[in-house]
Amino acid sequence: CKAMHVAQPAVVLASSRGIASFVCEYASPGKATEVRVTVLRQADSQVTEVCAATYMMGNELTFLDDSICTGTSSGNQVNLTIQGLRAMDTGLYICKVELMYPPPYYLGIGNGTQIYVIDPEPCPDSDF
């Protein structure tokens, strides 16, 4: 396993609809044709997998149908969007990139993006 640099923004604020987007960029050390991207969430010293996708260079990034993540790839950067977020989902979201093929295998883990999610205030009852 060889190490690889990964960069991502330090902080992102989710929209009022619970959607957060950020870029994950990696320093590809060679001609990788198969790349796996995983988003991990770290909160209270626990790390859980949020979503993952494997893609072939030049093809679309495909997450599972029930995934809360969507994304697009362009060269050695991936644009990730996480949907359905609520205040309790606030945490550090870490981008993990693996160059699966051809060998050698490379692994890169970003420093994480702190995503803040604020639940919208319910609208007050109106007389109208």
């Epitope: 960069a7 870029v23 590809s28 001609k31 990788a32 050695n76």
Partner: nanobody, 126 residues
Framework: EVQLVESGGGLVQPGGSLRLSCAAS????????VGWFRQAPGKEREELAC????????DYPGSVKGRFTITRDNAKNTVYLQMNSLRAEDTAVYYC???????????????????WGQGTQVTVSS
């Protein structure tokens, strides 16, 4: 859209040095990571070096590490490749390529670059 033009190639004796330039027009190069590649007749394109947008991140394959150095001058919209201790096997057409990125990293994979120069010939011979 950014356009790239390489220069600085030519004939050099074994053991000599050359500095190649990659000049950009049509856009500011500071928005782009830049890579240098080469292709010899009948061979695959080979990665040589890359540099991130700010110049703080560079990467080289083992084959040229220590002999080749990549630098950039964003004020001049130019990236340079300094090549020392040249050998006959360094004879090839040298290309620079650019990729618009958000952060400071760069890639050594030709697959990641979408804008290429037309190349400059380097011949190492006595």
């Amino acid at each position: 859209e950014v356009q790239l033009v390489e220069s600085g190639g030519g004939l050099v004796q074994p053991g000599g040095s050359l500095r190649l330039s990659c000049a950009a027009s049509g856009d500011t190069l500071e928005s782009f990571a830049v890579g240098w590649f080469r292709q010899a007749p009948g061979k695959e394109r080979e990665e040589l070096a890359c540099i991130g947008r700010t110049g703080e991140f560079t990467d080289y394959p083992g084959s040229v590490k220590g002999r080749f150095t990549i630098t950039r001058d964003n004020a001049k919209n130019t990236v340079y490749l300094q090549m020392n201790s040249l050998r006959a096997e360094d004879t090839a057409v040298y290309y620079c390529a650019a990729e618009r990125l958000v952060f400071h990293l760069c890639s050594l994979s030709e697959y990641d670059y979408d804008t290429w120069g037309q190349g400059t010939q380097v011949t190492v011979s006595s």
